[in-house]
């Protein structure tokens, strides 16, 4: 190989050992029989050399640095050449470095031809191995603007006081042009300006200077986004840290087209604007940091550009002004991440503050819109608390548990509507009365409706789930001892059509000791399946539940248990079941931890089934499933 550098070219070529390989053998640069590990060639020198090994690219790298002095004379602006030409260089990983020094008052602009650049974060690499590392200068301090790959949106970077651009090319890469040019501009009066151009839908991730380290103190950095007018842009902060400010405040400022309040100032922790039409600027402003404990300011953010959806022009009013203790969250439903570009799906408050999830609280009227290609990607979860603090005032009071129509009119599917029902301890209990009798969901007879009610204890220390219930069964009411949550969960979009079937009334009633009482009025011709609460996990220790089963005068009820033994093993106490005829008060008592469960029995009158648990040993829980079937009394039962 021969490398000859013209005089006055201000180019230095350095061949040095690169990242260590797994090869144990060394490789050397050989110059007139001397084996050397590093070679430096300066302007005006001509050197002939070889390598002592077959694959020098596994050992050595080459750096070509050109110093461009704009302080003492005119700057060589225009398209930047790769000098010496890549064809004259050994096939090593090469880094071309251009170090441009200029006065503070001069702006320098790097212009990148297509493909534009895409910024990458720490630990990331470029698929083709071609990277652009750009840094600037503040007095004597070097500031890293960022590392970039090809195929992105960054078209121009403006700096002042000098710029260092390093283009890294892998040894096998055929590229023979720099892909950028330098132009002079007037002073930009800030650290840098990065221009990002979107031709169509897409996203860009960008970072503050020196990321992930701290942004220089009291500096200003601007990103200019060029977005076609027919598209919408949304900004989301992926990662940020704030430093400890002594004076001024760290902030971001937006120049947004059509805004009457430019610049719009946001704190970094604020929700950032979305649904912006056309071009806009974003600036990051640092502060004067505390000298003792400066902390670091850093920001990584994403700009997502997409077509406005039909929904984005529609405003929905969600009136929660008459509601109390209620919150509504619109959020993405969980999905598997795909690797291809997925347009963002945002919900916007007052059309401007857009984010992937939004929580609305009671007491106000909210205006929302959507910036989303497919609204099925979102769902709604609502929580409402109904509490009674004064038992004298609440007793016999009723509340309707119904999803407000405002919420049903939103174009987003309702997932859960949870009512938290709170009562004063040991003073009041609750009764749930459905508009339509309920069926308990079991494996034997699953619910196939578009929604269900999930009833569970709302006492933090108590793990008690009464079950999942849907309309169209035989359960007339459910009485519960203390605080519960009732969640209306939807399973199909058809809930909108079936919404009229929902309806549950809760009333506060005098306190009773049993954990729960189910009132069951079976219909003829259908088998009613019932199971103990906490199915699969077992009825909690020392818990008692009852079923009040009505038998019409002309019918006989057949009570059937689905296993021979309960399977419970008691650590302390006894587990038992009482079956009691309501008319005669005659009762049968079964020891669940000892006896076999009763064979199918026939009941001519209404009866109780009461199950009380002991403290079971772990793994030997109490789970019982039974059914009730009505048959006309005329049938000969022998």
């Amino acid at each position: 190989f021969e490398i000859a550098l013209p005089r006055e070219s201000n180019i230095t070529v350095l061949i040095k050992l690169g990242t260590p390989t797994l090869l144990a053998k060394p490789c050397y640069i050989v110059i007139s029989k001397r084996h050397i590990t590093m070679l430096s060639i300066k302007s005006g020198e001509r050197i002939v050399f070889t390598f002592s090994c077959q694959s020098p690219e596994n050992h050595f790298v080459i750096e070509i640095q050109k110093n461009i002095d704009c302080m003492s004379g005119p700057c060589p602006f225009g398209e930047v050449q790769l000098q010496p030409s890549t064809s004259l260089l050994p096939t090593l990983n090469r880094t071309f470095i251009w170090d441009v020094k200029a006065h503070k008052s001069i702006g320098l602009e790097l212009q990148f031809s297509i493909p534009r650049l895409r910024q990458i974060g720490p630990g990331e690499s470029c698929p083709d191995g071609v990277t652009h590392s750009i840094s600037g200068r503040i007095d004597a301090t070097v500031v890293r603007i960022g590392t970039f790959c090809s195929n992105g949106t960054v078209s121009r970077i403006k700096m002042q006081e000098g710029v260092k651009m390093a283009l890294h090319l892998p040894w096998f890469h055929p590229r023979n042009v720099s892909g950028f040019s330098i132009a002079n501009r007037s002073s930009i009066k800030r650290l840098c300006i990065i221009e990002s151009v979107f031709e169509g839908e897409g996203s860009a991730t960008l970072m503050s200077a020196n990321y992930p380290e701290g942004f220089p103190e009291d500096e200003l950095m601007t990103w200019q986004f060029v977005v076609p007018a027919h598209l919408r842009a949304s900004v989301s902060f992926l990662n940020f840290n704030l430093s400890n400010c002594e004076r001024k405040e760290e902030r971001v400022e937006y120049y947004i087209p059509g805004s009457t309040t430019n610049p719009e100032v946001f704190k970094l922790e604020d929700k950032q604007p979305g649904n912006m039409a056309g071009n806009f600027n974003l600036s990051l402003q640092g502060c004067d940091q505390d000298a003792q404990s400066p902390g670091i300011l850093r920001l990584q953010f994403q700009v997502l550009v997409q077509h406005p959806q039909n929904e984005s022009n529609k405003i929905y009013v969600v009136d929660l002004s008459n509601e109390r203790a209620m919150s509504l969250t619109i959020e993405p439903r969980p999905v598997k991440q795909s690797r291809k570009f997925v347009p963002g799906c945002f919900v916007c408050l007052e059309s401007r503050t857009c984010s992937s999830n939004l929580t609305l609280t009671s007491g106000s009227k909210h205006k929302i819109s959507f910036l989303c290609d497919d609204l099925t990607r979102l769902w709604m979860n609502v929580e409402k608390t109904i509490s009674c603090t004064d038992h004298r005032y609440c007793q016999r009071k009723s509340y309707s548990l119904q999803v407000p129509s405002d919420i049903l009119h939103l174009p987003v599917e309702l997932h859960d509507f949870s009512w938290k029902l709170l009562v004063p301890k040991d003073r009041l209990s609750l009764v749930l009365v459905p508009a339509q009798k309920l069926q308990q969901h079991t494996h034997e007879k699953p619910c196939n409706t578009s929604f269900s009610y999930l009833v569970a204890s709302a006492i933090p220390s108590q793990d008690l789930y009464f079950g999942s219930f849907c309309p169209g069964g035989s359960i007339k009411q459910i009485q519960v001892k203390q605080n519960i949550s009732v969640t209306l969960r939807t399973f199909a979009p058809s809930f909108q059509q079936e919404a009229s079937r929902q309806g549950l009334t809760v009333s506060f009633i005098p306190y009773f000791k049993e954990e729960g009482v189910f009132t069951v009025t079976p219909d003829t011709k259908s088998k009613v399946y019932l199971r103990t609460p906490n199915w699969d996990r077992g009825l909690p220790s020392l818990t008692s539940v009852s079923w009040n089963i009505s038998v019409p005068r002309d019918q006989v009820a057949c009570l059937t248990f689905f296993k021979e033994r309960s399977g419970v093993v008691c650590q302390t106490g006894r587990a038992f079941m009482i079956i009691q005829e309501q008319r005669t008060r005659a009762e049968e008592i079964f020891s669940l931890d000892e006896d076999v469960l009763p064979k199918p029995s026939f009941h001519h009158h209404s009866f109780w089934v009461n199950i009380s648990n002991c403290s079971p040993t772990s793994g030997k829980q109490l789970d019982l499933l039974f059914s009730v079937t009505l048959t006309p009394r005329t049938v000969d039962l022998t």
Epitope: K16, L17, P20, T21, L22, L23, A24, K25, P26, C27, Y28, R34, H35, I36, T37, M38, S52
Partner: antibody
Framework: EVTLKESGAELVRPGALVKLSCKAS????????MHWVKQRPEQGLEWIGW????????IYDPKFQGKASITADTSSNTAYLQLSSLTSEDTAVYYC?????????????WGQGTTVTVSS | DIVMTQSPKFMSTSVGDRVSITCKAS??????VTWYQQKPGQSPKLLIY???TRHTGVPDRFTGSGSGTDYTLTISSVQAEDLALYYC?????????FGGGTKLEIK
Amino acid sequence: EVTLKESGAELVRPGALVKLSCKASGFNIKDYYMHWVKQRPEQGLEWIGWIDPENDNTIYDPKFQGKASITADTSSNTAYLQLSSLTSEDTAVYYCARFYGSYYYAMDYWGQGTTVTVSS
Amino acid sequence: DIVMTQSPKFMSTSVGDRVSITCKASQDVSTAVTWYQQKPGQSPKLLIYWASTRHTGVPDRFTGSGSGTDYTLTISSVQAEDLALYYCQQHYSTPYTFGGGTKLEIK
């Protein structure tokens, strides 16, 4: 375990020739450069040269050119140093060393040394 | 040839002391400097490579530093077992050359 076992001490007449051996175990000498270093009594280290056993390429310090000859036998995993026209100046301990080029560019394993005494 | 000038030739120190050995190259050797330790009656052992990288198993009291023509080996707190000869060596260019060595004695 990497070891370099050198041949035993040699007492030789001036003008004679001596061949020292260095048997490697725990690695294949074909994958490394093997160096030889001289240390005269109460003096410092002097680099003699290296061999690439894979192709028998050698490099010497010019002051040992003609004095030292480095060879290798990959079948026995052994490197050799032959010293000719011996004089009292050649009385020294001779070390063989493995040169690891990947990370270190340094001699990471050394033999125990062979003492050569040139005396009439 | 590149000449490596090592100083001092002898150094007498006490356990717990901090000592520095310097090596000056006759030209820029671009951190291609290795330090070896040779204990009495033993063969040399690799201590530091590429001017500042500690070899596996070398205690962290040994530190290498330097660039260009000036290099230093520092022992932050000398231990009795550090009694040895210390050599610097350049591998920037053949012929490889060693410094004259520094003999570290413990008082």
